[in-house]
């Protein structure tokens, strides 16, 4: 882990970022508040039955930036939204599923006869 | 440099309540949230809150929930914890302090005392 | 909530003996995050704490290096490696992991 002076550590936050969370609070949370020295974020994805799941919680400032840029995964419909301008600011965060595209359901399992 | 300021103190009657100050100056008042603890003589320090400036966040101690309440003016940059109910158990040195991720800078303390 | 347990309650030595503190929690302090927010204070009679230490190990700003912090996870240790008169009055660990964030009952350090 990255000291806090070293150079190629992200820009560390002046203070810490309380977060709501949801399916997704640490041990450290306290009445579905977490804290935070990167980012809330708001996410949806589909699980395995195809309904989907919004989960929301705290981000470390760690590999924070990666996450939140929502690069699309293959064959997973998923995504993500990322503040820091206020505390709580996820509650407000709300991310839609990526459209279905047809190649979805073309690159699922084939069954032979 | 940072300084926070707080009045000495403060004589109040039981059963009133009491609006307790602390002026920042030295640092941007809004990068930090501010904190309140409690000392009271060989009873140690306790965490009573803590408010974001940027947006008025409050996070309490749930023994302090009905007991605080904290506030901020960002534009004297000056935080206030005002006491309700007071009684004798309320005698006791408050202090405001900056927060980061930890207490980097304290007030000289408000000694509140509690008495008809 | 986080209970800190420090000990001793009464530390004496002579000027210029190493002291040790310790201070124990009764949960890991290792945040979420990865960061463990434990921090020292030194509080000298009529005067508010002063910050020492941070997250278990980092010296803050114009504190001599005879201070150091050291621990991992629930067992911390603040040392002086040769006691000045100016170090005398008492020591509090702090743990910002969990809220509500607590503090130890404190550790004077006096003349033997």
């Known amino acids: 882990k990255k000291e806090d002076g070293e150079s190629t550590a992200p820009t560390p936050r002046p203070k810490v970022l309380r977060c709501k969370c949801h399916h997704h609070c640490p041990e450290d949370s306290v009445n579905n508040i977490c804290s935070t020295d990167g980012y809330c974020f708001t996410m949806i994805e589909e699980d395995d039955s195809g309904l989907p799941v919004v989960t929301s919680g705290c981000l470390g400032l760690e590999g924070s930036d990666f996450q939140c840029r929502d690069t699309p995964i293959p064959h997973q419909r998923r995504s993500i939204e990322c503040c820091t301008e206020r505390n709580e600011c996820n509650k407000d965060l709300h991310p839609t599923l990526p459209p279905l595209k047809n190649r979805d359901f073309v690159d699922g399992p084939i069954h032979h006869r | 440099q940072v300084q926070l300021q707080q009045p000495g103190a403060e004589l109040v009657k039981p059963g009133a309540s009491v609006k307790l100050s602390c002026k920042a100056s030295?640092?941007?008042?809004?990068?930090?949230?501010m904190q309140w603890v409690k000392q009271r003589p060989g009873q140690g320090l306790e965490w009573i809150g803590e408010i974001d400036p940027s947006d008025r966040y409050t996070l309490y101690n749930q023994k302090f929930k009905d007991k605080a309440t904290l506030t901020v003016d960002t534009s004297s940059s000056t935080a206030y914890m005002q006491l309700s109910s007071l009684t004798s158990e309320d005698s006791a040195v408050y202090y405001c302090?900056?927060?980061?991720?930890?207490?980097?800078?304290w007030g000289q303390g408000t000694t509140l005392t509690v008495s008809s | 909530d986080a209970v800190m347990t420090q000990s001793p309650l009464s530390l004496p030595v002579s000027l210029g003996d190493q002291a040790s503190i310790s201070c124990r929690s009764s949960?890991?302090?290792?945040?979420?995050?990865?960061?463990?927010?434990l921090h020292w204070y030194l509080q000298k009679p009529g005067q508010s704490p002063k910050l020492l230490i941070y997250?278990?190990?980092n010296r803050f700003s114009g504190v001599p290096d005879r201070f150091s912090g050291s621990g991992s996870g629930t067992d911390f240790t603040l040392k002086i490696s040769r006691v000045e008169a100016e170090d005398l009055g008492v020591y509090f660990c702090s743990q910002t992991t969990h809220v509500p964030f607590t503090f130890g009952s404190g550790t004077k350090l006096e003349i033997k």
């Open positions: 302090a900056r927060f980061g991720y930890y207490v980097d800078y």
């Open positions: 030295g640092y941007t008042f809004t990068n930090y949230w």
């Open positions: 997250k278990v190990s």
């Open positions: 949960q890991s302090l290792v945040h979420s995050t990865g960061n463990t927010y």
